[in-house]
Interface confidence: low
Amino acid sequence: QVPWTPEPRAACGPSSCYALFPRRRTFLEAWRACRELGGNLATPRTPEEAQRVDSLVGVGPANGLLWIGLQRQARQCQPQRPLRGFIWTTGDQDTAFTNWAQPATEGPCPAQRCAALEASGEHRWLEGSCTLAVDGYLCQFGFEGACPALPLEVGQAGPAVYTTPFNLVSSEFEWLPFGSVAAVQCQAGRGASLLCVKQPSGGVGWSQTGPLCPGTGCGPDNGGCEHECVEEVDGAVSCRCSEGFRLAADGHSCEDPCAQAPCEQQCEPGGPQGYSCHCRLGFRPAEDDPHRCVDTDECQIAGVCQQMCVNYVGGFECYCSEGHELEADGISCSPAGAMGAQASQDLRDELLDDGEEGEDEEEPWEDFDGTWTEEQGILWLAPTHPPDFGLPYRPNFPQDGEPQRLHLEPTWPPPLSAPRGPYHSSVVSATRPMVISATRPTLPSAHKTSVISATRPPLSPVHPPAMAPATPPAVFSEHQIPKIKANYPDLPFGHKPGITSATHPARSPPYQPPIISTNYPQVFPPHQAPMSPDTHTITYLPPVPPHLDPGDTTSKAHQHPLLPDAPGIRTQAPQLSVSALQPPLPTNSRSSVHETPVPAANQPPAFPSSPLPPQRPTNQTSSISPTHSYSRAPLVPREGVPSPKSVPQLPSVPSTAAPTALAESGLAGQSQRDDRWL
């Protein structure tokens, strides 16, 4: 408890202050003094409020008394009630706390009485004559909000000194009522004044944030910087933002330029507007609006395919006439069977590999620990969260924490167990036109894809073949994922997988081969169900391994965590093929490219707002154009965006009920005991 001092002092909480004024006043004078400052005599109605009063009053003089806001009119005794007929100066008798010094007495009470609090001991309440001047009084001030006391910063000469709206000056406050002023003195001689003001958000806060004594260090509050505070050798302070963010106009906050950017597909921080829009592989910026992306018709490029070319949204495919098969470059055609037998044997060897060799050096995801569990006909997607960057916000997730259930055709065969061995870029022969996508074959060192030849395109398959990947994966000589730009990368592929002839169907593998797209080689291999004649093959895409950080795999842009076509998710398959693709899964890393979703046939929204109804798949052997369209997935909202600087708004003094009129004239005729404290 604080010792008694002759100076006024106060104790403030988030919504009210108690102030002690050690000045001799009558009850009416004390009430008026509190009212003039915008408050009222103290009304400690709860044990918590009484505790704050106790700590404020501390140890006062042995016989000292302080007026509180309780008075009783003549002949209004009610000894059986908690306040004994006394009324708070706010005009009511509500209370959850009393602290009378003496028991209630029966009998008449002819005179008006007022209550005072003992300045020492247990701060009990005594009743006595309202016209006596006592040692001091306690005021109470209510307000709409309070600002926390300012932390001491490096460079400050000492703690801030505060002036409250009720004219108390101190550096000891823990909370400062709305309308208070903080004066900060800096060691360099300068100073700053801050006002506790209303914020546009509705609360209250200091009118200035950030280093109050700039050039004098970062201090315990990180120099007011949202991300990183840098203290220069000369003592100057500057704020820096994490990669992908830029410093806001206030010099302290960090903002994500791509958060509000109107890019249709990909956004990268930088450029004159603070961001630049990019398009995915197979798309280019629209001429009339660089924020939009339009499909590139690669088939218009001379020589893009040796024989036939099919363009589709986001890519194209080369294929060959009957009796020819597509070569490994994905462009050229050669007579069927020229290289088939050995390649088929190589492929069979690859597929039957037990998966234990070379895993450490070839697979960037070798220690993925995830498992899959599927119900027949239902794919469960558990949302994963991006890593924590220590930032003051984290992205919202739609239906955060609830598994997203997609209703799929319930007549599938039972799901297979997840593959655990190394994942090879192997391809299985089929008797249907399984065409391989090559997203940019005209570039040098294009991906040499494995090939599936087809002899009679319109026919249904004779056997239930195993699924072939839409685009096989790359295997890199350095055993690492390459850096890939947002648009049309030069893909440094150094491995040519085997070629399988239609005349040598491969055996069913012990596990299914992965589907890995050319545009995003770090995709994780899917789990595939076997395929029946005339049905779609459903591709299961497991979650991206949590430890796999794609941050080093692409240009340093960034990406929303829950949007379609995230790196490592999208498998580019044309409608010509028999693959029916599942929606992409969310990654759990803030990866390379900041993407916004695009409607596409093979790309449903990341999380539908309601479950998709079961749909019976149809044969699409002759379909070239996309047959489904999906609405754009909602943008992930951002939290923690700093509100604009507020205009200081000063408080208005609230009016409270006046106490009952007090007898100010002489009290002749009243008993002698009315002028004493009992």
Epitope: P148, P151, C218, P220, C229, P392
Partner: antibody
């Protein structure tokens, strides 16, 4: 990955000065944006913040220990040190060094393994 | 003397949910300062579990969550596991200390 390692004598005589050093690897003390702190834990008891230092030398100390504590930094060695004078048996504890980050410079994201200091004659 | 008050011990059976409270004052939690939680397994240094009231560093399971209201905060652990048996400390900034303040610690026992 930032690593912190405490070093110093495990036994100190009463009234003497306890001296500990924390060596930081995997990151530079001078990089800015971080404070470097000492925390102690009495046997079977809770954690007590001793103080922290910025690479520029700005220090903040627990008021209850302020009169006896000095924390210093040597950026050339990527080290910071604790000196606690006039020790008594009540200063027997496990002493941890830690990196501090965040707006209020108050959360400890990397800790040393701790070193036990016994004050005894 | 500023303090953050925690219950000395809590317990729960595997799979259950337990909460640990941390009560401060208007000079620390009530002043708007963030609350952090640390887990200290026997014989090891404390490890950051929750920062900024309710955020988990990477690697911390989502079974751990934090919340803050007024002058107090709490740590909730759902799906209790035997490896969660440890001491848990809350921590905040304190304006009167101009520095960090730890709670007294809570020993969690998994029955």
């Amino acid at each position: 990955q930032v690593q912190l390692v405490e070093s110093g004598p495990g036994l100190v005589k009463p009234s003497q000065t306890l001296s500990l050093t924390c060596t930081v690897s995997g990151g530079s003390i001078s990089s800015g944006g971080y404070y470097w702190s000492w925390i102690r834990q009495h046997p079977g008891k809770g954690l007590e913040w001793i103080g922290y230092i910025y690479y520029s030398g700005s220090t903040y100390y627990n008021p209850s220990l302020k009169s006896r504590v000095t924390i210093s930094v040597d950026t050339s060695k990527n080290q910071f040190s604790l000196k606690l004078s006039s020790v008594t048996a009540a200063d027997t504890a496990v002493y941890y060094c830690a990196r501090v980050r965040g707006r209020s410079a108050t959360y400890f994201d990397y800790w040393g393994q701790g070193t036990t200091v016994t004050v005894s004659s | 003397q500023s303090v953050l008050t925690q219950p000395p011990s809590v317990s729960g059976a595997p799979g259950q949910r337990v909460t640990i409270s941390c009560t401060g004052s208007s000079s620390n939690i009530g002043a708007g300062y963030d609350v952090r939680w640390y887990q200290q397994l026997p014989g090891t240094a404390p490890k950051l579990l929750i920062y900024a009231n309710n955020n988990r560093p990477s690697g911390v399971p989502d079974r751990f969550s934090g919340s803050k209201s007024g002058t107090s905060a709490s740590l909730a652990i759902t799906g209790l596991q035997t490896e969660d048996e440890a001491d848990y400390y809350c921590q905040s900034y304190d304006i009167s200390l101009s520095g960090s303040l730890f709670g007294g610690g809570t020993k969690l026992t998994v029955l």
